[in-house]
């Protein structure tokens, strides 16, 4: 049988002679040279050579374990003369023994990491990992230890894991934002003679809200003209906050002061300024100075740093009111006056009244804006503001007239105010009611003496141009002279409509194909007005159900109220 022992060769051997790997030996080998040893398999004859008598195997080349860690070879023992196998062919392995010839290498040449400022000591920042190509199962060639070369005392690294942690409390982004750390990985467990590799880690402190906003001054001075209109900007304040992003966002509020009703503040998020605007008009003659207490506060507060607070600051804003020559002021924002229609020219409609608010108290002159009174219905007394009519007015033409009245200072025509004046024209019953439409009635021919139906021939209604008080209720009737008309009657429905009914049947087109029925309509005014309207009633051929078949005047009119 084969006699085996371990076959190995040290990698990277560079001696002058081939290195002995081991010896093939059979226990039937008597040493007479009758046995011939044959080597085959991976690297046989090139890397590994055998002395076929002694069975000694030598490595002829330098081997690299990191390239190939083992070789599988086949051993044979045969009779030197007959080549007859003396042992069964057998596989064996030659192992390449490791030496520490590879340094540790980091996965990345540089790393980038973030950690919030003011993080607690020991906060994990990032894990860096190195690898070593040497054999981890043999010796310490691949046993790595991490250490920090640059970056102390701010950061530390765990020797076994490569986890970088914060090492200093209260690191402040506002003082230093970026750190450059160098980490070393060394093999041989970190001992002398070990190989090493390094990597650079750039660590950025991210912002937290650890700074309150601060006004750079304790008082702001501003001024506003009394002529300024609400919404107009008065001035700006700005609190500085060294934090960035949403941690640095500031919002402004007025928290106190005698100007709280007259001024407001909004936040300009582009510039992070507080914009003070006029909320209500100010009057130099009434009050000449205002004071505001303005607060700047962070929008987003971090609960962890609440004890650093308060995250707000206040400042005093003093606003002085500047005098302006103001236009006259009407005593009312608008006026409503009434006048009866048909009133004689020169009738007084009403009065407007304005005053100069300035200390000078200049006299006022009034005028009508002629663009608003193109028909010149009205005049105004320039000195006292009384408005009068120039002609009778017709409510049915215009029920409301809207004019604009100007008031100007006598010494400065540019200082002018205007006011809308609405004039309601009151109704007088000066229109009689009329048919609401050009009604036409149709009645069926019949040889029956009774009316064919108790339905109205047509239902009529009326229109009156006057106001409702002088319009409905409308009363419909036949004129007194034909009240007992044998053919038709009018029944007032008491809802501003009336039905026209046939009093008999037996209408014949040959006898008479058209009837003209006068109808009196009077309105509900005091005194009432009335008109006589003529209803045309045509006699038509109908079917037994009362539906039209034909009329002599075929161009009959369809009405919503039509019924036959």
């Amino acid at each position: 049988g084969w006699v085996w022992n371990q076959f190995f060769v040290i990698e990277e051997y560079t001696g002058p002679d081939p290195v002995l790997v081991g010896r093939l030996h059979s226990d039937i080998d008597s040493g007479d040279g009758n046995i011939k040893y044959i080597l085959s398999g991976e690297g046989a004859g090139t890397i590994f050579v055998i002395d076929d008598k002694s069975g000694n195997i030598h490595a002829t080349k330098t081997l690299d374990r990191e390239e190939r860690a083992q070789y599988t070879l086949m051993a044979q023992a045969v009779d030197r003369d007959t080549n007859r196998p003396l042992e069964p062919p057998s596989e064996f392995i030659v192992k390449v023994q490791d030496i520490n010839d590879n340094p540790p290498e980091f996965l990345h040449e540089t790393y980038h990491a973030n950690v919030p400022e003011r993080s607690n000591v020991g906060t994990s920042v990032i894990q860096v990992t190195a690898s070593d190509a040497d054999d981890p199962t043999y010796g310490n060639s691949a046993k790595l230890v991490y250490s920090i070369l640059e970056g102390q005392p701010y950061f530390s690294v765990e020797a076994q894991t490569g986890i970088i942690r914060t090492a200093l409390p209260n690191m402040d982004r506002e003082a230093k934002e970026e750190y450059h750390v160098v980490i070393q990985a060394k093999d041989m467990g970190g001992h002398m003679g070990g190989l090493s590799g390094t990597t650079k880690v750039t660590i950025t402190l991210t912002d937290v809200n650890d700074n309150p906003p601060k006004f750079p001054q304790s008082v702001y001075q501003m001024s506003v003209s009394e002529a300024a209109v609400p919404g107009e900007e008065v001035g700006r304040v700005k609190a500085k906050d060294p934090d960035i992003g949403e941690n640095g966002l500031v919002t402004y509020n007025i928290v106190d002061g005698d100007g709280m009703e007259s001024f407001e503040i909004t936040t300009d998020y582009e510039t992070q300024e507080g914009v003070i605007k006029l909320k209500k008009p100010v009057d130099f003659e009434t009050k000449r100075a205002y004071s505001l207490k303005v607060e700047a506060a962070n929008v987003h507060i971090d609960p962890k740093f609440i004890s650093n607070g308060p995250f707000k600051d206040t400042v005093t804003v003093k606003i002085s009111v500047e005098d302006a020559d103001e236009p006259p002021m009407f005593l009312a924002p608008s006026y409503i006056h009434e006048v009866q229609e048909n009133a004689a020219a020169g009738t007084v409609v009403g009065r407007v009244h304005a005053k100069d608010p300035d200390a000078a108290n200049s006299p006022i002159r009034y005028s009508i804006d002629r663009h608003t009174d193109l028909d010149r219905f009205f005049t105004i007394n320039p000195e006292d503001g009384f408005i009068k009519t120039t002609k009778p007015l017709d409510r049915e033409e215009t029920a409301w007239l809207n004019i604009t009245v100007f008031a100007a200072e006598i010494h400065n025509r540019h200082q002018e105010a205007k006011v809308p004046v609405a004039i309601r024209v009151l109704d007088v019953n000066d229109n009689a009611p009329k048919f609401a439409a050009p009604y036409e009635g149709f009645i069926c021919e019949s040889d029956q003496t009774k009316p064919l139906s108790n339905q109205p021939i047509v239902t009529i209604s009326a229109d009156d141009k006057d106001d409702t008080a002088n319009g409905p209720r409308f009363i419909f009737s036949l004129p007194p002279e034909i009240i007992h008309n044998p053919n038709f009657t009018v029944r007032d429905n008491r809802d501003n409509t009336a039905g026209v009914y046939a009093r008999r049947g037996g209408f014949s087109r040959q006898k008479q194909d058209l009837y003209l029925l006068p109808i009196v309509i009077s309105d509900g005014g005091i005194p009432p007005m009335s008109s006589t309207n003529t209803l045309t009633i045509k006699v038509c051929g109908c079917d037994v159900n009362g539906a039209l078949l034909s009329c002599n005047a075929e161009a009959y009119i369809l009405n919503a109220g039509l019924s036959t």
Partner: antibody, heavy 119, light 108 residues
């Protein structure tokens, strides 16, 4: 409840005549005109004509003049329609229907009588 | 005579869907004389809507009618299974009275 009860189905030969009846109940027969409507198999409705039960006056659709004759018997509150010279075109369901005079709509319909003309 | 045309002749609708059918007259018809009838297979027609927009007794409020002149319509705000039927439009403005060809309503 207003009802119009019509006579039963009729199977008649071409050229013959048929008289179908419509008995009214639940209302005053003479207050409403009676109308007749034809519905051919699966088709729409066609007005045949109408009769005033008070006077016996009638109106016919031009298409049915000479084909249909409408009569009433006030004593039994019954309306009749006679169809003559029957052809296969006259096979249909025939309805009597009451007319509401004011707006002229058919507010009550009979049960329908099926007439089949076949040799 | 006045010719009455209904469209569509057949229509399918899902339950809960809004349904509208139209009726067109060849000449102007007073709204007082435009009516609608419902007919189910094997039954007589029933008055459904009279004078354009008035619901006959017992007709559900989901039905409505509108129109004027030559154009009229019947609408069901939310289709229900019991609404499956044929609907006929009818004018009696002028004699002879005429009916539309019918609109058959089915469930989708």
């Amino acid at each position: 409840e207003f009802q119009l009860q019509q006579s039963g189905p009729e199977l008649v030969k071409p050229g013959a005549s048929v008289k179908i009846s419509c008995k009214a109940s639940g209302y005053s027969f003479t207050d409403y005109n009676m109308n007749w409507v034809k519905q051919s198999n699966g088709k729409s409705l066609e007005w045949i004509g109408a009769i005033n039960p008070n006077y016996g006056t009638t109106s016919y659709n031009q298409k049915f003049k000479g084909k249909a004759t409408l009569t009433v018997d006030q004593s039994s509150s019954t309306a009749y329609m006679q169809l003559n010279s029957l052809t296969s075109e006259d096979s249909a369901v025939y309805y009597c229907t009451r007319l509401y005079y004011g707006s002229r709509y058919f507010d009550v319909w009979g049960t329908g009588t099926t007439v089949t003309v076949s040799s | 005579q006045i010719v009455v045309t209904q469209s569509p002749a057949i229509m399918s609708a899902s339950l809960g869907e809004r349904v509208t059918m139209t009726c067109t007259a060849s000449s102007s018809v007073s709204s007082s004389y435009l009516h609608w009838y419902q007919q189910k297979p094997g039954s007589s027609p029933k008055l459904w809507i009279y004078s354009t927009s008035n619901l006959a007794s017992g007709v559900p409020a989901r039905f409505s009618g509108s129109g004027s002149g030559t154009s009229y319509s019947l609408t069901i705000s939310s289709m229900e299974a019991e609404d499956v039927a044929t609907y006929y439009c009818h004018q009696y403005h002028r004699s002879p009275p005429t009916f539309g060809g019918g609109a058959k309503l089915e469930i989708k």
